[in-house]
Amino acid sequence: LYFSRDAYWEKLYVDQAAGTPLLYVHALRDAPEEVPSFRLGQHLYGTYRTRLHENNWICIQEDTGLLYLNRSLDHSSWEKLSVRNRGFPLLTVYLKVFLSPTSLREGECQWPGCARVYFSFFNTSFPACSSLKPRELCFPETRPSFRIRENRPPGTFHQFRLLPVQFLCPNISVAYRLLEGEGLPFRCAPDSLEVSTRWALDREQREKYELVAVCTVHAGAREEVVMVPFPVTVYDEDDSAPTFPAGVDTASAVVEFKRKEDTVVATLRVFDADVVPASGELVRRYTSTLLPGDTWAQQTFRVEHWPNETSVQANGSFVRATVHDYRLVLNRNLSISENRTMQLAVLVNDSDFQGPGAGVLLLHFNVSVLPVSLHLPSTYSLSVSRRARRFAQIGKVCVENCQAFSGINVQYKLHSSGANCSTLGVVTSAEDTSGILFVNDTKALRRPKCAELHYMVVATDQQTSRQAQAQLLVTVEGSYVAEEAGCPLSCAVSKRRLECEECGGLGSPTGRCEWRQGDGKGITRNFSTCSPSTKTCPDGHCDVVETQDINICPQDCLRGSIVGGHEPGEPRGIKAGYGTCNCFPEEEKCFCEPEDIQDPLCDELCR
């Protein structure tokens, strides 16, 4: 048995007569033989679930669900209740109604076995019938909504009449009907005004019924019509077996460059017309098991269950359903030497499904793990300016397909043939497994005999120690020009274009900082700033070279404080800034301020 609503509302007035009927509560059956029996909780509750008093005023007819006043609620009784309401004005009280034989403790009131009945209290006597508006004669202030379980026997779930009105204003005629389309499973009995289902409902056909209740009031010669929504929600049960959309039960996958733990290798989708079990229970009740195969496969793969609610069209309306994605995921990083082909089977079980048929599916994954060989081009040719500053990025080296790699740890090293001309360094970028070449020793760069630099690039897979090699030829171009006096270590210090471009700074490939002119659109990613190279800084990402020294690109790498209009980067730097952003790396501070148009002369004059 279950209640068709979780809450009911009615009005209570001072000195309302004992015997006044208040409202009906309704229970629906889960099985045809069930007979409802209602009982009231012992206590009345007030604001914030405060237990006010034992309920001495309201009774229920156990078989019909009719609540009525057992004795009049007078002023003194109401005062007594109000005193216990933690100092709040007592505007509403509620009772708990339980369905026997459900033996719920009084403290808990959860649908489906318990409903709350709220009474709005009016510190006056019942108003004169002639003063009541049609809306007050027809419907409670709070609009009801109903919940009906699918596949359950039909039954009565609502009674339209406002019983106190009918009891105290017998001369006012009130008639009700339901506006509904053809063939809907609801009926309003003209005599009893009870609303019932005609047949068992199927949620997978229709989940929500937005009906309209029409009330016609006849008082003497006048007739008025009031209409309110009458929504019914159909509650789901696990009556649909899982299926494969379009019959696809097999997925094939190749594991090659993406070999990182947690990589999704393949996905198979399962459709279930149900939305139960609910999300909290779903993973426990909707199980997936990777069937035992060889030990290697069991250690290498796991299956992840990703359920998602979707909506499907049924009979012209949309109903919710569930799609379950089963992802075959790498459980560990795979060595580049690994080379296998296998078939994996996954058993999916909708354990709540009662039939007919089975709630079990078998998913198949065909997986090929291919080995990866390391290749570098035979030769790299690059040029570098003699004016380049330390940490200037001058190029990249990358084993074949390195951009596509994940879970493959390749380290790059440079071996110099000229001992005194070891100018460059290389660091491996975790993002794309490439090696970033940068200037490491500017003194060597300036030596006349270091006009051509010869290196061997060696790429090594850390797990297998497999290697690839290439020649690197670097031409040193231009002549060295000493820096202006007073130039900062970091390009980011400069706040104006003029002072930016006349200086170099750490990370500058040309020996000169570059000014990036922003778009001036409020707090923007494209803020004005001075950079060693606008190709790499700022780009919203503190790369592996920039991490070597905070002076290279504090705009991307600073962990300190940013003053002024900005949006902080994740996890560091400036994601967006207002106007011009300049930084003092040694002080771990950046400032984003409106564009500074003043003439440099003003500084000294106005100081």
Epitope: G486, P488, R496, E499, I550, E586, E588, P600, D603
Partner: antibody
């Protein structure tokens, strides 16, 4: 040849203000490429950098957190000097105080120092 | 703040000895690192800046090495005027901090 000449009282009462001046010759307090620093030395704390002032389009000051709420370093372009003010002193501030020139942009090394002023905080 | 730890805190050596003093930073400071010499009653004097660059006028027997967190000052052949206290300093982030000093005494 750059020279830094310090001046100021050697005795200050607790809760009063310590004031020292550093006069520069052979360089300019407004020079773009350097910063002008105050450093102190005591047996308990060793060498402790206090703060600096420097000019680059605008004047900037940077102070050590340990004294930030009490310290002011001011340049005086007309006299080509800079000063230190340390408010609300306690006996803990007793030390040998130095001014020094810092090369702002090559990693801030201190290549010229004043002769030092021993300041005692005592009533 | 970045802590600078010097070792040893003092050492005894003879004229002509090769002496090495080490300094460790509590975090990576690249080469933003200097060495100073201080004699009693005098201000500190810059010896080495940027970890390994010799300040002009400083004898070539002084040399600096290291990068990151570990640094050394080496005096290849100790002279009588080298008996003094030596301080290391980081200038990577403010506040600039110094080591506690290493006193080089005559054996």
């Amino acid at each position: 040849q750059v020279q830094l000449q310090q001046s100021g009282p050697g005795l200050v009462k607790p809760s009063q203000t310590l004031s020292l001046t550093c006069a520069i010759s052979g360089d300019s307090v407004s020079s773009n490429s350097v910063a002008w620093n105050w450093i102190r030395q005591s047996p308990s704390r060793g060498l402790e950098w206090l703060g600096r002032t420097y000019y680059r389009s605008n004047w900037y000051n940077t102070y050590a957190v340990s004294v930030k709420s009490r310290i002011t370093i001011d340049p005086d372009t007309s006299k080509n000097q800079f000063s230190l003010q340390l408010n609300s002193v306690t006996p803990e501030d007793t030390a040998l105080y130095y001014c020094a020139r810092g090369h702002r942009y090559s990693g801030s090394y201190f290549d010229y120092w004043g002769q030092g002023t021993l300041v005692t905080v005592s009533s | 703040d970045i802590q600078m730890t010097q070792s040893p805190s003092s050492l005894s050596a003879s004229v002509g000895d090769r002496v090495t003093i080490t300094c460790r930073a509590s975090q990576n400071i690249n080469s933003y690192f200097n060495w100073y010499q201080q004699k009693p009653g005098k201000a500190p004097k810059l010896l080495i800046y940027a970890a390994s660059s010799l300040q002009s006028g400083v004898p070539s027997r002084f040399s600096g090495g290291g990068s990151g967190t570990d640094f050394t000052l080496t005096i290849s052949s100790l002279q009588p005027e080298d008996f003094a206290t030596y301080y290391c300093q980081q200038t990577y982030t403010i506040p600039w901090t110094f080591g506690q000093g290493t006193k080089v005494e005559i054996k």
